[in-house]
């Protein structure tokens, strides 16, 4: 009897009520491997979840998060809210970045502005909650008589903190 069941392909189940006949999975269910005695119920993507891939007889539905949220966990099991640029997500919701920090993304944490003086440079453009400072030439380069042939150094890409 076991051998009969092992012949049932994905998308079917081995129906004990019908002498081990391979029956197609009912609507809204699937079997991703052969030889299964039951089909699994399809995942439903509703509420904050939206369907990325429809369920078929051989594979489960795949969900994504609706606009304003992003996926967390295995197979997008959870949806976490996005924040605006200039904010960070805390345990109590989205909070504005403190002065001296910025976040140019909808997720992640606020990071300190680049300290231009550590590289011997000056601040060319002030930082905001949404943007890092832009470092320019060193103060010495801007003094009278200094050569202006050297273009300003590009802004340093800030290091990304872990989520």
């Amino acid at each position: 009897l076991q051998d009969l069941c092992s012949n049932c392909p994905a998308g079917t189940f081995c129906d004990n009520n019908r002498s081990q006949i391979c029956s197609p999975c009912p609507p809204n269910s699937f079997s991703s491997a052969g030889g299964q005695r039951t089909c699994d119920i399809c995942r439903q993507c509703k509420g904050v979840f939206k369907t990325r891939k429809e369920c078929s007889s051989t594979s489960n539905a795949e969900c994504d998060c609706i606009s304003g949220y992003h996926c967390l966990g295995a197979e997008c099991s959870m949806c976490e809210q996005d924040c605006k640029q200039g904010q960070e997500l805390t345990k109590k919701g989205c909070k504005d970045c403190c002065f001296g920090t910025f976040n140019d993304q909808k997720r992640g944490i606020c990071r300190p502005w680049t300290n231009c003086s550590l590289d011997g440079k000056s601040v060319l453009v002030n930082g905001t909650k949404e943007r890092d400072v832009v470092c320019g030439p060193s103060p010495a380069d801007l003094s009278p008589g200094a050569s202006s042939a050297t273009p300003p150094a590009p802004a340093r890409e800030p290091g990304h903190s872990p989520q």
Partner: nanobody, 124 residues
């Protein structure tokens, strides 16, 4: 491999109680803070409560303060959430999560591992 396995969810009437458990393996449990979060139907994640690695510091969302109690048994590598005076709005999938350090707060998320979740339904 780091694993978190929640249990204890179920159907309960308003005003009732449930105790959720989270069995941890694959890491030195007492070295890390732990957190409970939940996802109500059709909504995003909500932070519920956090506890430091030693168990000495606990934090709660305003919505559960005075009703829920987080605790841990480091000798059993298990995290708990005792939920009393349950309300319909507590209906959610509850996830246990490991934080990245031993300390925690009610501010930053510092979660690096999630469990699979256990469903709590509060209904009459």
């Amino acid at each position: 491999e780091v694993q978190l396995l929640e249990s204890g969810g179920g159907l309960v009437q308003p005003g009732g109680s449930l105790r959720l458990s989270c069995a941890a393996s694959g890491f030195t449990f007492s070295n890390y803070a732990m957190t409970w979060v939940r996802q109500p139907p059709g909504k995003g994640l909500e932070w519920v409560s956090s506890i430091s690695g030693s168990g000495g510091s606990t934090y709660y969302a305003d919505s559960v303060k005075g009703r829920f109690t987080i605790s841990r048994d480091n000798s059993k590598n298990t995290l708990y959430l005792q939920m009393n005076s349950l309300r319909a709005e507590d209906t959610a999938v509850y996830y246990c999560a490991k934080e990245g350090t031993g300390t925690t707060s009610d501010y930053y998320y510092n979660v690096d591992v999630w469990g699979q979740g256990t469903t709590v339904t509060v209904s009459s």
